[in-house]
Interface confidence: low
Amino acid sequence: TMETKGNISAEEGGSVVLQCHFSSDTAEVTQVNWEQRDQLLAVYSVDLGWYVPSVFSDRVVPGPSLGLTFQSLTTNDTGEYFCTYHTYPDGIYKGRIFLKVQESSAHFQIALPG
């Protein structure tokens, strides 16, 4: 089975952990893909470890576990994220997370007169 938190939120400028939880008594995870709007965020291969494309390498940190830590968030990062677990011999399991990046509360602070 595949479990995700479904909808998560984070603040602009902050970071968030994207995590999918896969459990099976019979299947072995061989590869995990993390994708955003048809863009590859990261790949984990059991054989070779993590690969993060250079376009995301300054903001995407592998882990914890088979999840991702997405840093320096902007409101443009709001949207759907997918984890694709390639398992052997069961095949593919896919999870979806919707991330809402909210404007920093600092934007709403009003300077009070001294």
Epitope: E28, T30, Q31, N33, L40, V43, S45, V46, D47, L48, Y51, P53, S54, V55, Y88, P89
Partner: antibody
Framework: QVQLQESGPGLVKPSETLSLTCTVS????????MSWIRQPPGKGLEWIGI?????NTYYANWAKGRVTISKSSNQVSLKLSSVTAADTAVYYC????????????WGQGTLVTVSS | DIQMTQSPSSLSASVGDRVTITCQAS??????LAWYQQKPGKAPKLLIY???TLASGVPSRFSGSGSGTDFTLTISSLQPEDFATYYC????????????FGQGTKVEIK
């Protein structure tokens, strides 16, 4: 001596599934990546996909949903569904292809023609 | 997706010439690049791996260089048996890839 040999039908009808087998000797599939590549007549090399030592598979974007690569003890299989004339090509298997030391060796290739 | 762009697509040269073929990756592939030679009716043959390491049995007139996005295959003194088509191949990433090979460079007799 490391050897690879592709086999399968040379003629496949449109809309059917192309099935090929690569039989290997001289090394273990349990510790090797294996790639499938094809070459349409008079054209360049087209990567189809790769299977890892643990059975993990990676497929070319154009082939996703149509291709399946699997393996047994000394054979790697390729299945390509819903074929058209555009799938007519020489099909090769090769050892390696993903952060290894290149694809080496290659099988001699087998020509598959898609025609009714 | 990582695209591999080879140039030129074809070239004419004479025996003894120095020949250079270039391959450009659309993103950083570090040194994860191989070069192959293919003659008509034959399977490709590995020449160079990890951008600059000569494969076993390949003559020393072949050499490879580069890292990151720009790579070069050089034949220092072209021999009659070197007239063939040459391909580069990235092996850095195989997820979400259309083709790992460049489009090929045909080396013909002038």
């Amino acid at each position: 001596q490391v050897q690879l040999q592709e086999s399968g039908p040379g003629l496949v009808k449109p809309s059917e599934t192309l099935s090929l087998t690569c039989t290997v000797s001289g090394f273990s599939l349990s510790s090797s990546y294996m790639s499938w590549i094809r070459q349409p007549p008079g054209k360049g090399l087209e990567w189809i996909g790769i299977i890892g030592s643990n059975g993990n598979t990676y497929y070319a974007n154009w082939a996703k949903g149509r291709v399946t690569i699997s393996k047994s003890s000394n054979q790697v299989s390729l299945k390509l569904s819903s074929v058209t004339a555009a799938d007519t090509a020489v099909y090769y298997c090769a050892r390696g292809g993903y952060r290894t030391s290149g694809m080496d060796p290659w099988g001699q290739g087998t020509l598959v023609t898609v025609s009714s | 997706d990582i695209q591999m762009t080879q140039s030129p697509s074809s070239l004419s040269a004479s025996v003894g010439d120095r020949v250079t073929i270039t391959c450009q990756a659309s993103q950083n592939i570090y040194s994860d690049l191989a070069w192959y030679q293919q003659k008509p009716g034959k399977a490709p043959k590995l020449l160079i791996y990890r951008a600059s390491t000569l494969a076993s049995g390949v003559p020393s007139r072949f050499s490879g260089s580069g890292s990151g996005t720009d790579f070069t295959l050089t034949i220092s003194s072209l021999q009659p048996e070197d007239f063939a088509t040459y391909y580069c191949q990235q092996e850095h990433l195989v997820a979400w890839i259309y083709n790992v090979f460049g489009q090929g460079t045909k080396v013909e007799i002038k």
